[in-house]
């Protein structure tokens, strides 16, 4: 008799999830000498242990602690780049500017980037059919809890000047409900972090507005200031030129406003 399976509103676990995580771990530890000591089989076992046989709406940060411990990594705390709703540009930037890091440049972020996963209560099966949607089903699902956990730890580790890339094309440039707005902002440590600097990325080619004056940016400034952290903001008017100048900063056109 086929067993009844809960139908969730979100997409199911990414196909070949175990193989993907293991392969990514091996690749990352080969590229990053400081993580060569990591045993990728143990990493996968800890990852699996966080959600397998557990109800996918009842996952806690505690479930991920064994994985967090194995994936402990020191990144330069003053070279952290956060982002919200503009992941691709942030990643393109750190691929060129190799001494700055997004969460996805760390082992744990790299392992899980763009993947979905969940299990089922009381069975060792991975659910490839559907997984809980954060809004429609539950917030304490395996993927959301993972990102909340690693994002909190990443923000807690930051020091000095922290940068965040924000999407100036969105109606809410700063969104309190994003991971950045709900987790990272509140976990920056005022005793370590001097300034949060926002880079607002413009979308339109002829958009010369000062998006640092946007009401949602003012809201971000207010939240940050109340936490005794200074705030500054910079418009990136031409993201294409910005990236080009990161690649070729000796070009004479790169000393003007980007």
């Amino acid at each position: 008799v086929p067993r009844w399976r809960q139908q969730w509103s979100g997409p199911g676990t990414t196909k070949r999830f175990p193989e993907t995580v293991l392969a990514r771990c091996v690749k990352y530890t080969e590229i990053h000498p400081e993580m060569r000591h990591v045993d990728c089989q143990s990493v996968w076992d800890a990852f699996k242990g966080a959600f397998i046989s557990k109800h996918p709406c009842n996952i806690t940060e505690e479930d991920y602690q064994p994985l967090m411990k194995l994936g402990t990594q020191t990144v330069p705390c003053n070279k952290i780049l956060l982002w919200s709703r503009i992941k691709d540009l942030a990643h393109q930037f750190t691929q060129v500017q190799r001494d700055m890091f997004t969460l996805e440049d760390t082992l744990l972020g790299y392992l899980a980037d763009d993947l979905t996963w969940c299990g089922e209560f009381n069975t060792s099966k991975i659910n490839y059919q559907s997984c809980p949607d954060w809004r429609k089903d539950c917030s304490n699902n395996p993927v959301s809890v993972f990102w909340k956990t690693v994002s909190r730890r990443f923000a807690e580790a930051a020091c000095d000047v922290v940068h965040v890339m924000l999407n100036g094309s969105r109606s809410k440039i700063f969104d309190k409900n994003s991971t950045f707005g709900s987790v990272e902002v509140h976990n920056l440590q005022p005793e370590k972090v001097q300034t949060l600097e926002a880079w607002v990325i413009h979308g339109g080619r002829e958009d010369s507005r000062d998006l640092c004056q946007d009401p949602t940016i003012k809201e971000l400034e207010s939240i940050i200031s109340k936490r005794n952290i200074q705030f500054s903001c910079k418009n990136i008017y031409r993201p294409d030129k910005f990236l080009q100048c990161v690649k070729n900063p000796e070009d004479s056109s790169c000393t003007s406003e980007i």
């Epitope: 001494d99 700055m100 900063p249 790169c254 000393t255």
Partner: nanobody, 115 residues
Framework: QVQLVESGGGLVQAGGSLRLSCAAS????????MGWYRQAPGKQRELVAA???????NYGDSVKGRFTISRDNAKNTVYLQMNSLKPEDTAVYYC?????????WGQGTQVTVSS
């Protein structure tokens, strides 16, 4: 913040040489490019030479073959060796540090070439 301290400017005769230095200090991430620009009275600031961390260089047309830019990444310092100087090289020479989207400028050092 970031400070740029230039040195090595002065008065030199046409055909002579000078070596400019610029040291960067302060909160530096990764100095993507350091370089030299110059501004003569009544003219716009123009590129003299720039060099990326990796060593890619870019020279202004009027100095190619005469000026050489180099850098010491460990010391966050850039150098400009100026040979076969001409009176038209007379200008204030500004050190530049470019970490997009940040651009920093030094205070400038005067180079005067007499004929």
């Amino acid at each position: 913040q970031v400070q740029l301290v230039e040195s090595g400017g002065g008065l030199v005769q046409a055909g002579g040489s000078l070596r400019l230095s610029c040291a960067a200090s302060g909160r530096i991430f990764s100095i993507n490019a350091m370089g030299w620009y110059r501004q003569a009275p009544g003219k716009q600031r123009e590129l003299v030479a720039a060099i990326s961390t990796a060593g890619s260089t870019n020279y202004g047309d009027s100095v190619k073959g005469r000026f050489t830019i180099s850098r010491d990444n460990a010391k966050n310092t850039v150098y400009l060796q100026m040979n076969s100087l001409k009176p038209e090289d007379t200008a204030v020479y500004y050190c530049n540090l470019n970490f997009p989207p940040y651009v920093y400028w030094g205070q400038g050092t005067q180079v005067t070439v007499s004929s």
